[in-house]
């Protein structure tokens, strides 16, 4: 969390941003809040990005003002116009690109004063893994697949019964480049698995960590997976 204070002739206002990550090809949110004003027409929101000549987005007098917008962001940005009045300056970024990563500044002007805060935005690809029993294999084998990751993640297997065991000798992980030539499909195979055990396939890069669990018993198979973004901190 980053909290910034304005420094100007007017009073300063508090602006708060939260570092976040965007998933390439999907829509993302750059979070920013500020001390609200009672009049929408007095609020100016400017989003800037380090290294970019034009603005990312500008909202003033109750509407978008895009004459200074950089071509890199054309048609891809929007504020939540109905929430500006309550102090929400967050930006929706459509079709996140790898190159959208970097340092952004959320700059606010209201009748109370000015303020700004920086936000570190990371971009990459992350997806939920699915673990299945590979019935085509000659021995008891599990197959963990996740369709989109970038940068290349690490994959680690763990088991509930053999806690702390190193499965690197009995597993094989491959990365296959997807058609857009950036993200990769992750496939990891674990051999010699035993029944009545819960196995976890953990995929992690510097943006996200995802885990796929599978419990195999004689009568059923139970699966569970979850994904967590790393380094989300407020400013």
């Amino acid at each position: 969390l980053i909290i910034g204070f304005g420094i100007s002739g007017r009073h300063s206002i508090t602006v708060t941003t939260v570092a976040s990550a965007g998933n390439i090809g999907e829509d993302g949110i750059l979070s920013c809040t500020f001390e609200p004003d009672i009049k929408l027409s007095d609020i100016v929101i400017q989003w800037l990005k380090e290294g970019v000549l034009g603005l990312v987005h500008e909202f003033k007098e109750g509407k978008d003002e895009l004459s200074e917008q950089d071509e890199m962001f054309r048609g891809r940005t929007a504020v939540f116009a109905d929430q500006v009045i309550v102090g929400n300056a967050s930006l929706r970024l459509k079709n996140v690109q790898l190159t959208d990563a970097g340092t952004y500044k959320c700059y606010i002007i209201t009748s109370k004063g000015k303020g700004n805060a920086n936000l570190e935005y990371k971009t990459g690809a992350f997806s939920m893994p699915e673990v299945n029993v590979d019935y085509n294999a000659s021995s008891e084998t599990l197959r963990c697949e996740a369709p989109r990751w970038f940068p290349q993640p690490t994959v680690v297997w763990a088991s509930q019964v053999d806690q702390g065991a190193n499965f690197s000798e009995v597993s094989n992980t491959s990365f296959e480049l997807n058609s857009e030539n950036v993200t990769m499909k992750v496939v990891s195979v674990l051999y010699n698995v035993t029944i009545n055990n819960t196995y976890s396939c953990m995929i992690e890069n510097d943006i996200a960590k995802a885990t796929g669990d599978i419990k195999v018993t004689e009568s059923e198979i139970k699966r569970r997976s979850h994904l967590q973004l790393l380094n989300s901190k407020a400013s």
């Epitope: 290294g51 200074e68 917008q69 950089d70 071509e71």
Partner: antibody, heavy 113, light 107 residues
Framework: EVQLVESGGGFVKPGGSLKLSCAAS????????MSWVRQTPDKRLEWVAG????????YYPDTVKGRFTISRDNARNTLYLQMSSLRSEDSAMYYC??????WGTGTTVTVSS | DILMTQSPSSMSVSLGDTVSITCHAS??????IGWLQQKPGKSFKGLIY???TLEDGIPSRFSGSGSGADYSLTISSLESEDFADYYC?????????FGGGTKLEIK
């Protein structure tokens, strides 16, 4: 065809001033950020100024800050670089660029006594 | 400022060869890198932007790759018109900075 044509280069004494112009054609000038980049005689490249599409936001490296001013006239499709307090190390070929992809033909600036 | 270290500074190669030029940034630049070509006595032409995307009209024998702080430009099946100077440029942060250049010469 997208074109950028620079003019205004020449010889100037140290401490002198010069104003470069860049005429743009073949694209909607007012929707693009523009820059000036120079190439020194030893072929080194240095970005010297940038400006937002509408001209409200300008950016400079420390080496030229306070001495160079970038501006634009969107009605005339023209980019400018006003250079003052010129030094011998400002001698270079100056290029006008749209982003990093479209470059002009360049104009030569020589600062010498 | 972000320092862009480009290598090699020059290389002698033959027609039909495949060559790679690399640029290392002093910090992560998130693919905010472009590659430029300058022919002797001429201006610059953009070849690649955003690390991997080919500019309009650039032949597919040119390709870009990399992530984080390390990037490369590869030219496969070199043709006579490819002998020129090549530069990388980062736009992740102001000031934009350039590599020192690579001169491609005919062996």
């Amino acid at each position: 065809e997208v074109q950028l044509v620079e003019s205004g280069g020449g010889f100037v004494k140290p401490g002198g001033s010069l104003k470069l112009s860049c005429a743009a054609s073949g694209f909607t000038f007012s929707t693009f950020g523009m820059s000036w980049v120079r190439q020194t005689p030893d072929k080194r490249l240095e970005w010297v100024a940038g400006i937002s599409p509408g001209g409200s936001y300008t950016y400079y490296p420390d080496t030229v800050k306070g001495r160079f001013t970038i501006s634009r006239d969107n009605a005339r499709n023209t980019l400018y670089l006003q250079m003052s307090s010129l030094r011998s190390e400002d001698s270079a070929m100056y290029y006008c660029t749209r982003g990093r992809s479209v470059w002009g033909t360049g104009t030569t600036v020589t600062v010498s006594s | 400022d972000i320092l862009m270290t480009q290598s090699p500074s020059s290389m002698s190669v033959s027609l039909g060869d495949t060559v790679s030029i690399t640029c290392h940034a002093s910090q992560d630049i998130s693919s905010n890198i472009g590659w430029l070509q300058q022919k002797p006595g001429k201006s610059f032409k953009g070849l690649i932007y955003h690390g991997t995307t080919l500019e309009d009209g650039i032949p597919s024998r040119f390709s870009g790759s990399g992530s984080g702080a390390d990037y490369s430009l590869t030219i496969s099946s070199l043709e006579s018109e490819d002998f020129a100077d090549y530069y990388c440029v980062q736009s992740a942060q102001f000031p934009w900075t350039f590599g020192g250049g690579t001169k491609l010469e005919i062996k």
